[in-house]
Interface confidence: low
């Protein structure tokens, strides 16, 4: 921003204080140091004579020697003697700068904050997208791959990374399967991706009697009730953040079974042998 | 300790409807089916129907569909078996069980006698 | 519906013999994905519910003493009580455990010479 001339020392070489300014368009004058200020405290002692004009009327300026220029040599010693309250010392374009200056800064950090501040990124479990079972009749062992789906979206106004997801399935309160995947994808601004992934699960030992169940042709329809947890972690801006979310699920153990999305929350648990 | 306590003995006459509750404890209501049987005076056991507490679905013995009403209450852990158009053939005692994941019930209530008599 | 049937309806025994029941079904109870038997063995005491002795034709269930075996496949079974004892006077039925209705036998009444 510019400097306020009135605060300049008397000393100030016209370069610094006023360019431009020729005696013949001041209304006040060239003048000895020696006068006293404003304050009437003693300037600096200076070789040259008092002088005074009062514009384009008054008598040519004997330190001009009649040219209304200052002689070449004698700039830096004099000064201009300027009233404080000349218009020209507050130029009315300078508030309006400042401001424009001030409101063009103001506008461009609120726009920065706006665009950079970080939102949530959402993760919406949606369900089991499907479902594929194998038995191992000898160790009477369930295999259940569980393909599950999200929905991730992001809202900032920059693109995210989706770093990894780590799931876990449990069954009575114990995971039968556990799954991690890296570097899956980047959402861009205001964007939303449909991510799947697949969790292996096994059934066997000490649940072997599930076994049983979900072979027992009595029931079409052979659903466990499982609990989904999953973790996405994203990262922005070197900043990492992690969203995690639990859902109870029905899955059909006794057959291969594809999903409309989000219907295993609703399944018939058990249905009659028609 | 697992326990499934039923509603004391009815005596009721024929027609209007008869509730019986089946209050589960010692075990989480909703892992489990409950079942209800029917044992008549010298008659087998005849299996009525099921009722999963998760999510209320139920599944019956066609023989008993219009004549019982299977619900439960999660928030009390009761099963309920509601018995309409009552006759002396309804006459009986009736168990409540559960299963978990098989057909074959483990624990059982300990029966409420059913008396239909005008 | 499977039909289960019973035999005999009733049997007197002294205490200390070996007794065996028989129970037919009217279809295989043998699940060809895993199998397994589907059926159950009860035993009920008078002015008492029914208690699981035998489940999937042969596992036991826990608690229940070994002198009570169950055997058979397909729609042939058999439970045998060994050492019979004063506390298995009691009407046994066996269930279909395989198709809905679940499905008892008439029972075979348990009785002291």
């Known amino acids: 921003m510019g400097k306020s001339l009135s605060h300049l020392p008397l000393h100030s070489s016209k370069e610094d204080a006023y360019d431009g300014v020729t005696s013949e368009n001041m209304r006040n004058g060239l003048v000895n140091s020696e006068v006293h200020n404003e304050d009437g405290r003693n300037g600096d002692v200076s070789q040259f004579p008092y002088v005074e004009f009062t514009g384009r009327d008054s008598v040519t300026c004997p330190t001009c020697q009649g040219t209304g220029r200052i002689p070449r040599g004698q700039e830096n010693q004099l000064v201009a003697l300027i009233p404080y309250s000349d218009q020209r010392l507050r130029p009315r374009r300078t508030k309006l700068y400042v401001m424009a200056s001030v409101f063009v800064c103001l506008l461009l950090s609120g726009l920065a904050v706006f665009f950079l501040f970080p939102r949530s990124i959402d993760v919406k479990y949606i369900g089991v997208k499907s479902a594929y079972v194998s038995y191992d009749v000898q160790k009477r062992t369930i295999y259940l791959n569980i393909t599950n789906t999200l929905n991730i979206t992001n809202n900032n106004y920059y693109s995210v990374e989706v770093e990894n997801i780590t799931a876990q399935v449990q069954f009575s309160k114990t995971v039968i399967g556990k799954a991690r995947l890296n570097n899956i994808t980047i959402i861009g601004p205001l964007d939303m991706k449909q991510i799947d992934y697949t969790v292996p699960t096994v059934i066997a030992e000490e649940m072997s009697y599930m076994y049983d169940f979900c072979t027992l042709i009595s029931i079409k329809v052979h659903n466990i009730v499982l609990m989904m947890q999953v973790t996405v972690t994203t990262t922005y801006f070197g900043h990492s953040e992690q969203i995690s979310q639990e859902r109870y699920q029905y899955v059909d153990c006794g057959r291969n079974t594809t999903y409309q999305l989000g219907q295993s929350e609703y399944l018939n648990v058990l249905q009659p042998q028609q | 300790e697992v326990q499934l306590q039923q509603s004391g003995p009815v005596l009721v006459k024929p027609g209007p409807p008869v509730k019986i509750s089946c209050k589960a404890s010692?075990?989480?209501?909703?892992?489990?089916?409950i079942h209800w049987v029917k044992l008549s005076h010298g008659k087998s056991l005849e299996w009525i129907g099921l009722?999963?507490?998760?999510?209320?679905?139920?599944d019956y013995n066609q023989k008993f569909k219009g004549k019982a009403t299977l619900t439960v209450d999660t928030s009390s852990s009761t099963a309920y078996m509601e018995l309409n158009s009552l006759t002396s053939e309804d006459s009986a005692v009736y168990y409540c069980?559960?299963?978990?994941?098989?057909?074959?019930?483990?624990?059982w209530g300990q029966g409420t006698t059913v008396t239909v008599s005008s | 519906d499977i039909v289960m049937t019973q035999s005999p309806s009733s049997l007197s025994v002294s205490a200390g013999e070996k007794v065996t029941m028989s129970c037919k079904s009217s279809?295989?109870?043998?699940?060809?994905?895993?199998?397994?038997?589907?059926l159950a063995w009860y035993q009920q005491k008078p002015g008492q519910p029914p208690k699981l002795l035998i489940y999937?034709?042969?596992t036991r269930e826990s608690g229940v003493p070994d002198r009570f075996t169950g055997s058979g496949s397909g729609t042939d079974f058999t439970l045998t009580i060994s050492n019979v004892q004063a506390e298995d006077l009691a009407v046994y039925y066996c269930?279909?455990?395989?198709?809905?209705?679940?499905?008892f036998g008439a029972g075979t009444k348990l009785e002291l010479k």
């Open positions: 009722v999963y507490p998760y999510n209320g679905d139920t």
């Open positions: 279809q295989s109870l043998l699940n060809s994905g895993n199998q397994r038997n589907y």
């Open positions: 069980a559960r299963t978990y994941y098989a057909n074959s019930p483990d624990y």
């Open positions: 999937g034709a042969s």
């Open positions: 010692g075990f989480t209501f909703t892992d489990y089916y």
């Open positions: 269930q279909n455990d395989h198709s809905y209705p679940l499905t």
